[in-house]
Amino acid sequence: MGVEGCTKCIKYLLFVFNFVFWLAGGVILGVALWLRHDPQTTNLLYLELGDKPAPNTFYVGIYILIAVGAVMMFVGFLGCYGAIQESQCLLGTFFTCLVILFACEVAAGIWGFVNKDQIAKDVKQFYDQALQQAVVDDDANNAKAVVKTFHETLDCCGSSTLTALTTSVLKNNACPSGSNIISNLFKEDCHQKIDDLFSGKLYLIGIAAIVVAVIMIFEMILSMVLCCGIRNSSVY
């Protein structure tokens, strides 16, 4: 005998919520794997900066995306399948995963706040490497997609550390149409925008983290309520 009434509502709410979560994880994982395994990227695992290979922040970022996508898919599946199957075991595992993820988020938040300057530096290096790859290997569509995302999200273009060639390519091809790059290349410096994001606009990252935390707590409560409802319905 299945759950009834309010518990049934929670069951479907949890299912829909986690199905969306699972889909989002799939998209992130798909994009990350495309970025990682596209032939035009794999032959540039180590880009040359001057005469020495650059430490590949670009790929570290992609591996983080792969991990995030995989975890999202796994947790989404547990919640989704656990809810629809009314499985106490799966829902219990789902709850445990959420508790671990919540703890990880809190730890990452504290670590991120303490190391925000280093993270900003790594993000800038990630941008520079993607930009370099997009210019050096003009077929690297994945790197172009990363650069485009940076430019459109941060409403910026280029940085004050560009080479002459990158400056020329950016001016002619890779800047958002509304960007000020044509009149003044460094007016919307992406390095500056990244620094601003990690200092002046740190509250935006904080708000995003709080929203994620609230959703996690909400899901934990729902999964526990549903688990108890399943237990009670199986008693009668």
């Epitope: 040359e48 900066l49 005469d51 210019v135 003009d138 077929d139 002459a164």
Partner: antibody, heavy 119, light 112 residues
Framework: EVQLLESGGGLVQPGGSLRLSCAAS????????MSWVRQAPGKGLEWVSY????????DYADSVKGRFTISRDNSKNTLYLQMNSLRAEDTAVYYC????????????WGQGTLVTVSS | QSVLTQPPSASGTPGQRVTISCTGS?????????THWYQRLPGTAPKLLIY???NRPSGVPDRFSGSKSGTSASLAISGLRSEDEADYYC???????????FGGGTKLTVLG
């Protein structure tokens, strides 16, 4: 050893067309940006155009924009410069040069080919 | 009229030290783009001599050195030799014009 050999220069009347070629050897042509630089008699060097490794990106000096077209054939290791609507001021020695991303400059040059625009 | 200004000629005797200047503006040399120097010996292709203001490609003797200060750059040749007689060009990138710019060239004559 990197070698760049230009050809196709000569005498042409104003308004005429000419196609310059540059045969490259001694390096992976398909992985490098290439450029054309010219020098008019008694003048300094002037950058004309560049093309990216897979022809995605190109750019031109304002003085030649709309008249000159840069292209490449990676299977033949050859760079081209199609020059249309030629003017007397286009008279120059045209050099083909490899652009180095890491050094951010023209690291290898050809001997040049002379283009004379005169009636 | 070239964007980068070089003296049309320079001269020196063997063993002497000669300096060639290259003056630009805040949109090219002063903008932080490297200044590069090329040597063109009579009847040969231009050859990269100095890149990124002061770096020498392999094979270039250490008699050649480059430096940059503000909106100007300079090429110094110490222990001048007869085989150094050539045309020397400086080059940078101009962010306002969006083009690679060159100096008008300096003809170096080794006397005696």
């Amino acid at each position: 050893e990197v070698q760049l050999l230009e050809s196709g220069g000569g005498l042409v009347q104003p308004g005429g067309s000419l196609r310059l070629s540059c045969a490259a050897s001694g390096f992976t042509f398909s992985s490098n940006y290439m450029s054309w630089v010219r020098q008019a008699p008694g003048k300094g060097l002037e950058w004309v155009s560049y093309i990216s490794s897979s022809s995605t990106y190109t750019d031109y000096a304002d003085s030649v924009k709309g008249r000159f077209t840069i292209s490449r054939d990676n299977s033949k290791n050859t760079l081209y410069l199609q020059m249309n609507s030629l003017r007397a001021e286009d008279t120059a020695v045209y050099y083909c040069a490899r652009y180095s991303y890491s050094r951010d400059n023209f690291d290898y040059w050809g001997q040049g080919t002379l283009v004379t625009v005169s009636s | 009229q070239s964007v980068l200004t070089q003296p049309p000629s320079a001269s020196g005797t063997p063993g002497q030290r000669v300096t060639i200047s290259c003056t630009g503006s805040t949109s090219n040399i002063g903008a932080g783009y490297g200044t590069h120097w090329y040597q063109r010996l009579p009847g040969t292709a231009p050859k990269l001599l100095i890149y990124g203001n002061s770096n020498r490609p392999s094979g270039v003797p250490d008699r050649f050195s480059g430096s940059k200060s503000g909106t100007s750059a300079s090429l110094a040749i110490s222990g001048l030799r007869s085989e150094d007689e050539a045309d020397y060009y400086c080059q940078s990138y101009d962010t306002n014009l969006s083009v690679w710019v060159f100096g008008g060239g300096t003809k170096l004559t080794v006397l005696g």
